[in-house]
């Protein structure tokens, strides 16, 4: 039975040219996390594997950095980075848990940094 829940940084905004941290946190389950995938729409950005560590998709290598933790840092943001991002937790034996983050990249310097709530 899947009892876990994923908390995410929710809807966030950042300034063009800047960077942002995408974070998810899985709680309320005893399941063991074996892999976390980060995706943007249908594109795989990165994988954090419990055994093999991080793998960043070649097309994002210059602008994506692993961490902190199981999170992902997006750098050199462009307006085209606006959209939905998903963290997909593969857990044993529960299955997959998916969290959603919406990022808006703003031209203006008044972009609001940070999250709706903090991840532990």
């Amino acid at each position: 039975m899947m009892t876990g829940t994923i908390e995410t940084t929710g809807n966030i905004s950042a300034e063009k040219g800047g960077s942002i941290i995408l974070q998810c946190h899985l709680s309320s389950t005893t399941a063991q996390v074996t892999q976390v995938n980060w995706e943007q729409q249908d594109q795989l950005l990165a994988i954090c594997n419990a055994d093999l560590g991080w793998h960043i998709s070649p097309s994002f290598k210059d602008r994506v950095a692993p961490g902190p933790g199981l999170g992902l840092t997006l750098q050199s943001l462009t307006v085209n980075d606006t959209g939905e991002y998903f963290c997909i937790y593969h857990t044993y034996p529960d299955g997959t848990y998916t969290g959603r983050i919406f990022l808006e990249v703003l031209e203006s310097s008044v972009a609001e940094h940070g999250a709706r709530f903090q991840i532990p």
Partner: antibody, heavy 122, light 107 residues
Framework: EVQLVQSGSDLKKPGASVRVSCKAS????????MNWVRQAPGHGLEWMGW????????TYVQGFTGRFVFSLDTSVNTAYLQISSLKAEDTAVYFC???????????????WGQGTMVTVSS | DIQLTQSPTFLSASVGDRVTITCRAS??????LAWYQQNPGKAPKLLIY???TLQSGVPSRFSGSGSGTEFTLTISSLQPEDFVTYYC?????????FGQGTKVEIK
């Protein structure tokens, strides 16, 4: 070489306790969940449950609660199964088995210990 | 709980035969099924995972197929060492039960 090596066969009297060990080598112990499987003589395989090798949190399948305890010593890459108040019906081979595969659609028990025969007899 | 039923329970065949073992699930389990081979007095050995993916080092005469509720393990040409017991296991929802086993015997 990835392997799981279990402790040797054990003969116990009813009411006694037994501890079966499962020593892992050749891989990162805390990256893969560990399972315990029972096989009574002449019978099939029964999944007893598993232990989270990151947190040490055990989960027991119905029928294996109470007298059965899964534990870990990550400093020596070893998982343990302890059975207390042994009964004749606990006589079986006990296997530890690693959950391989990293994504939910590829999980399977990819590495097994050789098995430990526990005989309960007065 | 999801139950798995293997058929047949016993199978008599000869070296070189093509044999098929079926595993039926009591509800849909997608492709979350594994097949194991067990020699007497030995630990099970993983043959197939994700219904059809051959585990590294397993001979290509073994293959798996199916999805949903019906799955098959096929041995294209039985070898002397294949006359042992085979189990299916689902990995879709707790608890991860095994089938009752199929013993392949020499005719």
């Amino acid at each position: 070489e990835v392997q799981l090596v279990q402790s040797g066969s054990d003969l116990k009297k009813p009411g006694a306790s037994v501890r079966v060990s499962c020593k892992a080598s050749g891989y990162t112990f805390t990256s893969y969940p560990m399972n315990w499987v029972r096989q009574a003589p002449g019978h099939g395989l029964e999944w007893m449950g598993w232990i989270n090798t990151n947190t040490g949190n055990p989960t027991y399948v119905q029928g294996f609660t109470g007298r059965f305890v899964f534990s870990l010593d990550t400093s020596v890459n070893t998982a343990y199964l302890q059975i207390s108040s042994l009964k004749a019906e606990d006589t079986a081979v006990y296997f530890c088995a690693r959950t391989g595969g990293h994504t939910y659609d590829s999980y399977a028990f990819d590495v097994w210990g050789q098995g430990t025969m526990v005989t309960v007899s007065s | 709980d999801i139950q798995l039923t293997q058929s047949p329970t016993f199978l008599s065949a000869s070296v070189g035969d093509r044999v098929t073992i079926t595993c039926r699930a009591s509800q849909v389990i997608s492709s979350s099924l594994a097949w194991y081979q067990q020699n007497p007095g030995k630990a099970p050995k993983l043959l197939i995972y994700a219904a059809s993916t051959l585990q590294s080092g397993v001979p290509s005469r073994f293959s798996g197929s199916g999805s949903g509720t019906e799955f098959t393990l096929t041995i294209s040409s039985l070898q002397p060492e294949d006359f042992v017991t085979y189990y299916c296991q689902h990995l879709h929802g707790y608890p991860y039960n095994f089938g009752q086993g199929t013993k392949v015997e020499i005719k």
